[in-house]
């Protein structure tokens, strides 16, 4: 009944099929495909797997992304991550007494190491691996401010859970203003919601990194899934690029 | 240089205000446009350009919506506003003491006239007019849940200013809840953001239409911008329209 | 009375001049062009000769498929079976039958089209469309297409019955 | 929607999203993307019907507006609507490379 | 970005939003609509090069994907990215109604 | 088109040395690991070492490792092995082959290069 | 080491049957294997790669399967030019390893 000229579906799938190509190599701002020359033979490293599954689970979460993206974000974004100090450094010791909260501090040479300028970095997302939770908990997110003072940042309700589950926190602008400072070591609080009136204000979420008295492997793995910062930054050699376009069509 | 076609741009123009001619008949679920024999003569009424300029002025501060939008998005949303309780209500007697809080309630049955169906309401905005405000206030707001028991919802930092300004919460979840629901009144409550340590819980920032002590005229224009809740819905009539073709494409 | 076209000489423009009456104002159009049922605008004529597709109806969600023919004017599309007129999926729907609209395209009602080419006493002769010949593929599938006055037959051969929906002779299930 | 769910198990001929697995090694020839192999880029396929819209237009024809020409364009065009990124593995030299790619699967698509 | 800041102010060729002032009554013939009196909807318009790119394509034509074909689509179209709602007020009899209409106003487009 | 071509093979003592070399052309060869594999008469197939594009990582089978080394001329598109203290076991064709991609696999091969180790 | 144990060690069959020969692995090597076709007097040719991609130029008629431990090749329907031995090789860890071969005969 069709009046229109056949589609030829195929040519449509090649044609998509190439600008793909293209489209990739120009994400990673690469003339070409790189060179495989020096990849070691076997697998990939456990925590390069681990890295990619943590941005796939990411991926799995959100919502699908309404398009809309600035010309940087057209770019590819490295992922790395950065460990929880752990907590048998002396930085913990002032802050062990609390009911009411957790602490985590990152090493700042380390997230410089993996983001050199702050400018380039285009998502940090502290995640943390909150295990089972007996009754609902409302908790907030605070960042170390000056010596002794905290900053709000965000709050978070959880649900209760037989399942341990990730959570996440959106903390860009707080990595980005400790990338641009001269601190060693800096940190956010997990807090029970304290209400006005309300005096019960303990944290009764157990997130993992926390609990003691593991040994051996146990604490090993346990460990490996201590609060973490996932970061996407665009990488440095490939910010210069953007600079030189930048208001440019 | 282009092997394209010569656009003639103004017949884009033609078919582009065509198009629109029809969009906005669909979008109002109109199949012509509305006979006018009825409008009465002179100027739109204050209360109605008020409600206009208040919408007006909510998408200016929107930033440029990205679009997907559900297919119930795509029809054309009737605003209006209902007004909080005035202060003087014998609702308010029990909840005045506190400092770190205000109390905000509505009449249902006023909203329920306004959205006759829960799942007609698309959005909700809960807007204050914040007066002066001389030092950053962290305020937390909480929907009334039960005889004496309130469910946190949001919170916002607050920027000292020199001039008043209108803060806006989405609470659209509530006020579909209330219309669910047979309750008379339902309310919110404005409060300091009180952190597990500090006990400076004092709510500084002044809100329009709490201030005592106003007489006659001042009073009056105080009145209306007392609180209020800003909905969006789809007309009731429209709503059927949609019910039967929502499977189809 | 307030002159609206000295007021605003852009009124009409970009093709028509104003006319000025009592309390209001109306468009005198230029060639080519109508004016709009409030008499405010011009738009263009869809010149009737024109030929285009014809679009069986807009229930289909595929209705830029559903084409009765390819190379009909709007009279002989809309004053017979059409939905819609068009080509590349760009359509104009035919006016609602009974409408003003409807009665200006097709004066003669449905079935007929006027033939400018032969006129009696000044007038345009009318002529039955002959649907066989402009849709018979597409309107009798399975079927022998007879034309009438106004209108069409659709002949089943014995076991089948004409589906008007479907527009096609269909089996009778015994 | 015009997405997986209603497109993939449709037959719909107008604007909707079409399925299209790539696989670097074969569709590409690319050995050195070593995480994912391949994922579901999909595509946005279809007319969007322009409707030449009077005010005489009856409310079967107005209703078409939604799914066809939702943005009163002067040509609607089958475009993605939602998108989810990729987040791939590669060497860079002998070192492995976490990096996501963002807007490249595409979910759903809209006429626009 | 494809935004009226960028494209009003330039001669670009391609894709980009284009001004259009509405005046419901001098476009579109109707005085129903009481507030306002017209509208900025603009509209998107210009070509959206596809450009096949095989393994030896150089940086600058890859550097093009960006702006002319993002997401990679098989027939890249100039589209609206951002786009604002209107509200209008009009009457129902002797009512009159505030009623906001979403994704009127085009402020940026893309290649999509 | 790829081509690789073995050279160097012979008859060479018990305790002697040889170096083989493999020119590659068709290809940009500092893009691609390369590899040796050998097969002794009527046997199955064993790789014996392979190098990374720059040169910069070597890897050897244990039945040759401080016996043989691996190395390349990028300037020249040469791969080399250089073999010492040879043994009668070490007697095999010689292939060179190059390595497609971080997957490891042998995409293509030379036509190969008898070395024997007797007395 | 990794330890490739192929069966069998060698097959008679005819033009046009379907021919399967298996390779074993001594631990997991997830998808790191590859398979080669050597004729007499020949240096041997990629057949399949990563378990089950072709090789480009490789007829269709050759598909790998398998994961982990156990892997097949199959050639869905014999030629005469397919007569040949059959090697798998896995590149999972230093030092890479081949099986023993399959020898395929005419019957």
């Known amino acids: 009944l069709s009046t229109c000229k056949t589609i030829d579906m195929e040519l449509v799938k090649r044609k998509r099929i190439e600008a793909i190509r293209g489209q990739i190599l120009s994400k990673l701002r690469l003339a070409s495909p790189p060179s495989q020359g020096e990849v070691p033979p076997g697998p990939l490293p456990e925590a390069v797997l681990a890295l990619y599954n943590s941005t796939r689970d990411r991926v799995a979460g959100e919502s699908a992304e309404p398009e809309p993206e600035p010309e940087a974000d057209y770019y590819a974004k490295e992922v790395t991550r950065v460990l929880m100090v752990e907590t048998h450094n002396e930085i913990y010791d002032k802050f062990k007494q609390s009911t009411h909260s957790i602490y985590m501090f990152f090493n700042t040479s380390e997230l410089r190491e993996a983001v050199p300028e702050p400018v380039l970095l285009s998502r940090a997302e502290l995640r943390l691996l909150r295990l089972k939770l007996k009754v609902e908990q409302h908790v907030e997110l605070y960042q170390k401010y000056s010596n002794n003072s905290w900053r709000y940042l965000s709050n978070r309700l959880l649900a209760p859970s037989d399942s341990p589950e990730w959570l996440s926190f959106d903390v860009t602008g707080v990595v980005r203003q400790w990338l641009s400072r001269g601190g060693e070591i800096e940190g956010f609080r997990l807090s029970a919601h304290c209400s006005c009136d309300s005096r019960d204000n303990t944290l009764q979420v157990d997130i993992n990194g926390f609990t003691t008295g593991r040994r051996g492997d146990l604490a090993t793995i346990h460990g490996m899934n201590r609060p973490f910062l996932l970061l996407m930054a665009t990488p440095l050699e490939r910010a210069q690029h953007l600079q030189s376009s930048r208001h440019r069509r | 240089l282009s092997t394209c076609k010569t656009i003639d741009m103004e017949l884009v123009k033609r078919k582009r205000i065509e198009a629109i001619r029809g969009q906005i008949l669909s979008k109002l679920r109109l199949a012509s446009p509305p006979s006018q024999g009825e409008v009465p003569p002179g100027p739109l009424p204050e209360a109605v350009l008020a409600l206009y300029n208040s919408t007006r002025d909510r998408v200016a501060g929107e930033s440029a919506e990205p679009e997907p939008e559900p297919e119930a998005d795509y029809y054309a949303k009737e605003v209006t506003r209902v007004l909080m309780v005035e202060t003087h209500n014998e609702i308010y007697d029990k909840f005045k003491q506190s400092t770190h809080s205000i109390y905000m309630f509505f009449n249902t049955s006023e909203l329920r006239e306004a959205v006759p169906e829960p799942v007609l309401l698309s959005r909700a905005e809960l807007r204050l007019l914040r007066l002066k405000l001389k030092v950053e206030q962290h305020v937390e707001l909480y929907q009334k849940y039960s005889n004496n028991s309130w469910r946190y919802l949001s919170n916002r930092l607050l920027a000292p200013s020199d001039s008043p300004e209108w803060l806006s919460f989405d609470v659209t979840g509530v006020v579909r809840q209330w219309l669910s629901r047979g309750g008379e009144i339902e309310g919110f409550r404005l409060s300091a953001h009180c952190s597990c340590d500090s006990r400076d819980n004092t709510l500084q920032v002044d809100i329009n239409g709490f201030t005592t002590g106003r007489r006659g005229d001042l009073a009056t224009i105080h009145g209306m911008n007392r609180p209020f809740l800003l909905l969006m819905a789809t007309p009731l009539e429209r709503a059927q329209h949609l019910q039967s073709s929502r499977h189809r494409r | 009375d307030i002159d609206e076209c000295s007021q605003d000489p852009s009124l009409c423009l970009p093709h028509g001049a104003c006319k000025n009456l009592q309390g209001s104002y109306v468009c005198v159009c230029d060639e080519g062009f109508t004016p709009t049922q409030d008499q405010h605008g011009c738009e263009e004529v869809e010149q009737p000769h024109h030929k285009k597709e014809c679009y069986l109806n807009f229930d289909d969600t595929v209705f830029c498929d559903s084409v009765l023919a390819t190379n009909v004017t709007q009279q002989e599309c809309c004053c017979s079976l059409g939905a819609g007129w068009g080509d590349h999926c760009e359509i104009y729907p035919c006016p609602v039958y009974s409408s003003a609209e409807f009665h200006s395209l097709c004066p003669d009602g449905k079935g007929y089209t006027q033939d400018n080419n032969i006129v009696n006493y000044g007038i345009p002769a009318h002529r039955d469309i002959d649907e066989c010949m402009l849709f018979g593929s597409e309107i009798c599938k399975e079927g022998k297409c007879v034309n009438t006055q106004p209108g069409y037959e659709c002949y089943c051969k014995q076991g089948f019955y004409y589906d008007g929906n479907l527009l096609e002779c269909v089996d009778v299930d015994e | 929607a015009l997405d997986t769910n209603y497109c993939f198990s449709s037959t719909e001929k107008n604007c909707c999203v079409r399925q299209l697995y790539i696989d670097f090694r074969k569709d590409l020839g690319w050995k050195w993307i070593h995480e994912p192999k391949g994922y579901h880029a999909n595509f946005c396929l279809g007319p969007c019907p322009y409707i030449w819209s009077l005010d005489t237009q009856y409310s079967k024809v107005l209703a078409l507006y939604n799914q066809h020409n939702p943005g009163a364009s002067a040509a609607p065009c089958c475009v993605p609507q939602a998108l989810e990124p990729l987040p791939i593995v590669y060497y860079v030299g002998r070192k492995p490379k976490v990096e996501q790619l963002s807007n490249m699967i595409v979910r759903s698509c809209k006429c626009s | 970005a494809l935004d009226t800041n960028y494209c009003f102010s330039s001669t670009e060729k391609n894709c980009c939003v284009r001004q259009l002032y509405i005046d419901f009554r001098k476009d579109l013939g109707w005085k129903w609509i009481h507030e306002p009196k017209g509208y900025h909807a603009n509209f998107c318009l210009g070509p959206c090069p596809y450009i096949w790119s095989l393994d030896t394509q150089y940086s600058k034509v890859l550097a093009l994907y960006n702006q002319h074909n993002p997401g990679a689509s098989a027939a890249p179209c100039c589209v609206p990215q951002a786009l604002e709602p209107l509200p209008i007020v009009y009457y129902v009899g002797r009512k009159p109604k505030v009623e906001q209409l979403s994704n009127m106003i085009v402020r940026s487009c893309k290649c999509s | 088109e790829v081509q690789l071509l073995e050279s160097g093979g012979g008859l060479v003592q018990p305790g002697g040395s040889l170096r083989l070399s493999c020119a590659a052309s068709g290809f940009t060869f500092a893009d691609y690991a390369m590899t040796w594999v050998r097969q002794a008469p009527g046997k199955g197939l064993e790789w014996v070492s392979a190098i990374s594009g720059s040169g910069a990582a070597t890897y050897f089978a244990d039945s040759v490792k401080g016996r043989f080394t691996i190395s390349r001329d990028n300037s020249k598109n040469t791969l080399y092995l250089q073999m010492n203290s040879l043994r009668a076991e070490d007697t095999a064709v010689y292939y060179c082959?190059?390595?497609?991609?971080?997957?490891?696999?042998?995409?293509?091969w030379g036509q190969g290069t008898l070395v024997t180790v007797s007395s | 080491d990794i330890q490739l144990t192929q069966s069998p060690s060698s097959l008679s069959a005819s033009v046009g049957d379907r021919v399967t020969i298996t390779c074993r692995a001594s631990q997991s090597i997830s998808s790191y294997l590859n398979w080669y076709q050597q004729k007499p007097g020949k240096a041997p040719k990629l057949l399949i790669y990563?378990?089950?991609n072709l090789q480009s130029g490789v007829p269709s008629r050759f598909s790998g399967s398998g994961s982990g431990t156990d892997f097949t090749l199959t050639i869905s329907s014999l030629q005469p030019e397919d007569f040949a031995t059959y090697y798998c090789q896995q590149t999972y860890t230093v030092p890479l390893t081949f099986g023993g071969g399959t020898k395929v005969e005419i019957k």
């Open positions: 082959a190059r390595v497609s991609s971080g997957h490891w696999d042998f995409d293509y």
């Open positions: 990563a378990a089950s």
